[in-house]
Amino acid sequence: AVNGTSQFTCFYNSRANISCVWSQDGALQDTSCQVHAWPDRRRWNQTCELLPVSQASWACNLILGAPDSQKLTTVDIVTLRVLCREGVRWRVMAIQDFKPFENLRLMAPISLQVVHVETHRCNISWEISQASHYFERHLEFEARTLSPGHTWEEAPLLTLKQKQEWICLETLTPDTQYEFQVRVKPLQGEFTTWSPWSQPLAFRTKPAALGKDT
């Protein structure tokens, strides 16, 4: 039997994926559970199998269609159910009505590249992935740069309060190795949260020019 305190949290990537995590204190690790999604105004429904990610939590991705297809809109409500197998039948463990565009978490930005690098500055660009056209320009970004001898957690956050898919890093040290990451967040949504950080982009500033002999 499954009992104890439970949590059921899902996010929509704004296109064709709903990712869910179900946690249950006292649940058996080998319990077979799934998430079932029923939109209120669509002909389709979808199921995914919850797989263990830790001692008491399971996760799965509801794949609603092709990665860039717009499967849900701002007016959709999706009823999400957690079902766990008990003997020969499925038992409903939780029911949640979910407004996709109130629960957004986009995919991490991709295609990071150095556009131009100098001794003290570096221009970097990136792209957003699988983001709805509904946002138009209503996105913001956070970026961070890893300096030698520091950790990511120590890196100051740079905030871009508009849809700007590039940044010019300044006051860098010449001939130094850095790493850079960026994440994205739509402006709308009661529970909307930051995307995961992008894969780090490594770059090196150019050496300072040698002084000329007199």
Epitope: T5, S6, Q7, F8, T9, A94, Q96, D97, F98, K99, E102, N103, G189, E190, F191
Partner: nanobody, 127 residues
């Protein structure tokens, strides 16, 4: 703080529908998570549904089996409970409640999580 008044209860035949309303006054409605509970004669108060401040997530008791829909209209300071395919076992006094603390909409809240309660409205389902 808000005051809550439920309405919309009554007598309905099994298989029928009712829509309960809970009107809030005297506070900032959008700063409260809202819930519905019910209490049948001789039984404990039972959770029915709870919705977050903006309505982005709503949790339902498994016993509702997808027959109930809870929604809120922050412009009208009202939360609703639409009950379809009603059964005799749905007979109870239905209470609206407000929670001042933050509610994520990812778990089943306890009645003790709610600070403010309405006076209740009777729902009777006949067979």
């Amino acid at each position: 703080e808000v005051q809550l008044v439920e309405s919309g209860g009554g007598l309905v035949q099994a298989g029928g529908s009712l829509r309960l309303s809970c009107a809030a006054s005297g506070g900032t409605f959008s700063s409260y998570a809202m819930g519905w509970f019910r209490q049948a004669p001789g039984k404990e108060r039972e959770f029915v549904a709870a919705t977050t401040r903006g309505g982005g997530r709503t949790m339902y008791a498994v016993s509702t089996e997808g027959r109930f829909t809870c929604s809120r209209d922050n412009a009208k300071n009202t939360v609703y409970l639409l009950m379809n395919s009603l059964k005799p076992e749905d007979t109870a006094v239905y209470y609206c409640a407000a929670m001042t603390s933050y509610y994520s909409g990812t778990y089943y809240p306890d009645s003790s999580d709610f600070d403010i309660w309405g006076q209740g409205t009777q729902v009777t389902v006949s067979s």
